[in-house]
C-alpha cells in the first residue's frame, strides 16, 4: 500500500478520504486506526455504525469522526481541532470479524497555524529533504510520501 499524506493546520479540522471498491467491500464495516510504531499494531480509533445500513451516520470518538458512503465507496474521517500529537501514521480499514483489510495508509501532518505566533517547535511533520517510501500525492491538503521518506518522526 502507498502512503498518502494529509496535512492540516493546528487547531483546525482535517478531513481524510479513503476511496474503496464499494462492491468488493459490500456489507463490511469500516474503521480508522492509528499505527503504533513502524511494525506495531494498528490501534482502533473509531469505527462505523454497527449496522452497515447506517454507516452514513457520523460516529465520533473524542475529536475524531467517521462516516461511510457505502454506495459511492468513500470513507471519510474528520479530525477536529487538530493537535501536534495527532501527527502520525493511520489506516483506513475494512472489517471482517476481528480482522481487517487495509484500504489506505495515511500519514497525518500537523502544520503550525500561521496566525499563531507561539513556539511551533513541537509541531512535527516530515521535512521535504527526508525521503519516504511508496509515495503518491493527493491533496486535502495532502500528498504522498517521497521515496525513502519515513512515516515516523525521529526518536531521540
Amino acid at each position: 500500500h502507498n502512503t498518502t499524506v494529509f496535512q492540516g493546520v493546528a487547531g483546525q479540522s482535517l478531513q481524510v478520504s479513503c476511496p474503496y471498491d464499494s462492491m468488493k467491500h459490500w456489507g463490511r464495516r469500516k474503521a480508522w486506526c492509528r499505527q503504533l510504531g513502524e511494525k506495531g499494531p494498528c490501534q482502533r480509533v473509531v469505527s462505523t455504525h454497527n449496522l452497515w445500513l447506517l454507516s452514513f451516520l457520523r460516529r465520533w470518538n473524542g475529536s475524531t469522526a467517521i462516516t461511510d458512503d457505502t454506495l459511492g465507496g468513500t470513507l471519510t474521517i474528520t479530525l477536529r481541532n487538530l493537535q501536534p500529537h495527532d501527527a502520525g501514521l493511520y489506516q483506513c480499514q475494512s472489517l471482517h470479524g476481528s480482522e481487517a483489510d487495509t484500504l489506505r495508509k495515511v500519514l497525518v501532518e500537523v502544520l503550525a497555524d500561521p496566525l499563531d505566533h507561539r513556539d511551533a517547535g513541537d509541531l512535527w511533520f516530515p521535512g521535504e529533504s527526508e525521503s519516504f517510501e511508496d509515495a503518491h500525492v493527493e491533496h486535502s491538503i495532502s500528498r504522498s510520501l517521497l521515496e525513502g521518506e519515513i512515516p515516523f518522526p525521529p526518536t531521540s
Epitope: G27, R28, N50, L51, W52, L53, S55, H96, G97
Partner: antibody, heavy 122, light 108 residues
C-alpha cells in the same frame, strides 16, 4: 438470467494436475466475490476459498491453503480451481457460488454452479 | 475460525409438522452475516435465508430465520413434501467463511 456454469466431470489419477472452471453470465462478473465449496461423497459442505475477480484478491480456508489455487480471468468471466498434484482424498463434488449483494449489507451465496464431479483413482 | 454446530443431526417429522433447526456459533457472529441453505440429493445448495432472518427471492414464507450472537434458528412452520432435505447454516462474518455440519430433515 444470472448463472454460473461449471466445467464437466473429471476422472484423474493421483499426482496429476487439474483445473476446473466456473463461467458467470447475466451479471457484472467483476463486482461479485466467487467462492468454491467442496462436498465429499455423503458429507457436508466445506468452504474452500473465495476470489474477487475485479482485482483477483483471494482468501483461502486454512484447510485448503497450499492445496489448491483459486484464480479468475475477468476478460472471459471465468473463475478457476486448480490442483498441481491430485490425491485420492480430493474425490468430491466441487461447487462455485456467487456471494450476493443484499440490501442492508447482507451477503449470502445466492447463485450456484451445477457442480463438477472430480474422481481421483489409480 | 468460527465453528458452526448444527443440531439435531437428523430430524424425523411428518408433512404438516413444524421443524426447528438450530445453529450455534463458537463465537459471536453479527446477524448480518448468517445464512441458511437447503440441499436436495443430486442438487446444488439453494440460498433460503440471508442476514439471519431475510428470505431470499422465491422462498416461501413458511421458512423463517431468527437469532443473534451465537444462537440461530431456522423454522419451517408447516413441512411440505418438497421440504425434506439437508439444511446448512453458513457464516460470512469472518474468514474463513464456514458451514455447519448440516441437519437432515427426513420423513417420519
Amino acid at each position: 438470467e444470472v448463472q454460473l456454469v461449471q466445467s464437466g466431470a473429471e476422472v484423474k489419477k493421483p499426482g496429476e494436475s487439474l483445473k476446473i472452471s466456473c463461467k458467470g453470465s447475466g451479471y457484472s462478473f467483476t463486482t461479485y466475490w466467487i467462492g468454491w465449496v467442496r462436498q465429499m461423497p455423503g458429507k457436508g459442505l466445506e468452504w474452500m476459498g473465495i476470489i474477487y475477480p475485479g482485482d483477483s484478491d483471494t482468501r483461502y480456508s486454512p484447510s485448503f491453503q497450499g492445496q489448491v489455487t483459486i484464480s479468475a480471468d475477468k476478460s472471459i468471466s471465468t473463475a478457476y480451481l486448480q490442483w498441481s498434484s491430485l490425491k485420492a482424498s480430493d474425490t468430491a463434488m466441487y461447487y462455485c457460488a456467487r456471494a450476493g449483494h443484499y440490501d442492508g449489507g447482507h451477503l449470502g451465496m445466492d447463485v450456484w454452479g451445477q457442480g463438477t464431479t472430480v474422481t481421483v483413482s489409480s | 475460525e468460527i465453528v458452526l454446530t448444527q443440531s439435531p443431526g437428523t430430524l424425523s417429522l411428518s408433512p404438516g409438522e413444524r421443524a426447528t433447526l438450530s445453529c450455534r456459533a463458537s463465537q459471536s457472529v453479527s446477524s448480518d452475516y448468517l445464512a441458511w441453505y437447503q440441499q436436495k440429493p443430486g442438487q446444488a445448495p439453494r440460498l433460503l435465508i440471508y442476514g439471519a432472518s431475510s428470505r431470499a427471492t422465491g422462498i416461501p414464507d413458511r421458512f423463517s430465520g431468527s437469532g443473534s450472537g451465537t444462537d440461530f434458528t431456522l423454522t419451517i412452520s408447516r413441512l411440505e413434501p418438497e421440504d425434506f432435505a439437508v439444511y446448512y447454516c453458513q457464516q460470512d462474518y469472518s474468514y474463513p467463511w464456514t458451514f455447519g455440519g448440516g441437519t437432515k430433515v427426513e420423513i417420519k
